[in-house]
């Protein structure tokens, strides 16, 4: 019978946003299948995405158990079952992922402005608190629950009639800003973790919302 060798996975890459975490790798399999294993530094290996022909594996369920732990994954390659190869007794080839610490490395998803309300010359802008798949006591936690005061939001706001932007910051999900009476303003927010020093320190900007549209209320 033939001896079709298996090819080790390569380019193992973590893709993670708001703790939704996928491991991706190459190559697309030909006559082989993959199994992913994940472990903390001190833990046992746990098999996930067992016997799969996919080149990605959702590891969210594992990493949300403790988002401050550091995880390592490895991808094993096996000959597909119909390959009638018989060779020497050798371990399946595998490749290790980079280490991944969700709390430090998950990307911040694009935030959404939930509402804004004007009272006189003050506007209250509220950022929607995103839900994550992180649990505590059988309850899903929000991004704010997980990050606490490590997470801030930056508000960019400007008069509809001009391009000069102002900024405000909050470590809650609400802003209270001063505006000129009778002027319409536009708003965009960005999530930031100031303690991070890497490219994933900031989210992308939220969609722009402007006064005079459906999300806002105005009271004199």
């Amino acid at each position: 019978s033939g001896t079709t060798n298996t090819v080790a996975a390569y380019n193992l890459t973590w893709k993670s946003t708001n703790f939704k975490t996928i491991l991706e790798w190459e190559p697309k399999p030909i006559n082989q299948v993959y199994t992913v294993q994940i472990s903390t530094k001190s833990g046992d290996w746990k098999s996930k995405c067992f016997y799969t022909a996919d080149t990605e594996c959702d590891l969210t369920d594992e990493i949300v158990k403790d988002v401050k732990q550091t995880y390592l994954a490895r991808v094993f390659s096996y000959p597909a079952g119909h390959v009638e190869s018989t060779g020497s007794t050798e371990e399946p080839p595998y490749e290790n992922s980079p280490e991944f610490t969700p709390y430090l490395e998950t990307n911040l998803g694009q935030p959404t402005i939930q509402s804004f309300e004007q009272v006189g010359t003050k506007v209250n802008v509220t950022v929607q608190d995103e839900w994550t798949l992180v649990r505590r006591n059988d309850t899903f936690l929000s991004l704010r629950d997980v990050f606490g005061k490590d997470l801030i939001y930056t508000l960019y706001y400007w008069k509809s009639s001009s391009s000069g932007k102002k900024t405000a910051k909050t470590n809650t999900n609400e802003f209270l800003i001063d505006v000129d009476k009778g002027e319409n303003y536009c708003f965009s927010v960005q999530a930031v973790i100031p303690s991070r020093r890497t490219a994933n320190r900031k989210s992308t900007d939220s969609p722009v919302e402007c006064m005079g549209h459906e999300k806002g209320e105005s009271r004199e």
Epitope: T3, N5, T6, T35, D44, W45, K46, S47, K48, F50, Y51, F76, Y78, P79, G81, V83, E84, S85, T86, G87, S88, T89, E90, E91, P92, P93, Y94
Partner: nanobody, 114 residues
Framework: QVQLVESGGGLVQPGGSLRLSCTAS????????MGWHRQAPGKGLELVAV???????HYADFVKGRFTISRDNAKNAVYLQMNFLRAEDTAVYYC????????WGQGTMVTVSS
């Protein structure tokens, strides 16, 4: 090279049960997959069920809810409990272990007939 020896095949009536066993001649690493394939008369080899070293399983759709695979790492063994057998389950059942290569047993015949 690892030798795999199957046992437990035989003749059984429809609706009956059989338990297949497979033992390896040498230590099988927990990183190996172990499992069962089958080949019906005049057909190709098809996956039945596979199991990882830590007990994660994968089944072909046609056996889900009827067959159960298990593994004893200390004994270098894999088992297939087959319940509610049907005539179409008649086949030679091959044990296999997969590391870098697939290692195959000689097969054990399962005949489901009244």
């Amino acid at each position: 090279q690892v030798q795999l020896v199957e046992s437990g095949g035989g003749l059984v009536q429809p609706g009956g049960s059989l338990r297949l066993s497979c033992t390896a001649s040498e230590t099988i690493s927990s990183t190996y997959i172990m499992g069962w394939h089958r080949q019906a008369p005049g057909k190709g080899l098809e996956l039945v069920a596979v199991i990882s070293g830590d007990g994660v399983t994968h089944y072909a759709d046609f056996v889900k809810g009827r067959f159960t695979i298990s593994r004893d790492n200390a004994k270098n063994a894999v088992y297939l409990q087959m319940n509610f057998l049907r005539a179409e389950d008649t086949a030679v059942y091959y044990c296999y272990a997969a590391g870098r290569w697939n290692h195959w047993g000689q097969g054990t015949m399962v005949t489901v007939s009244s």
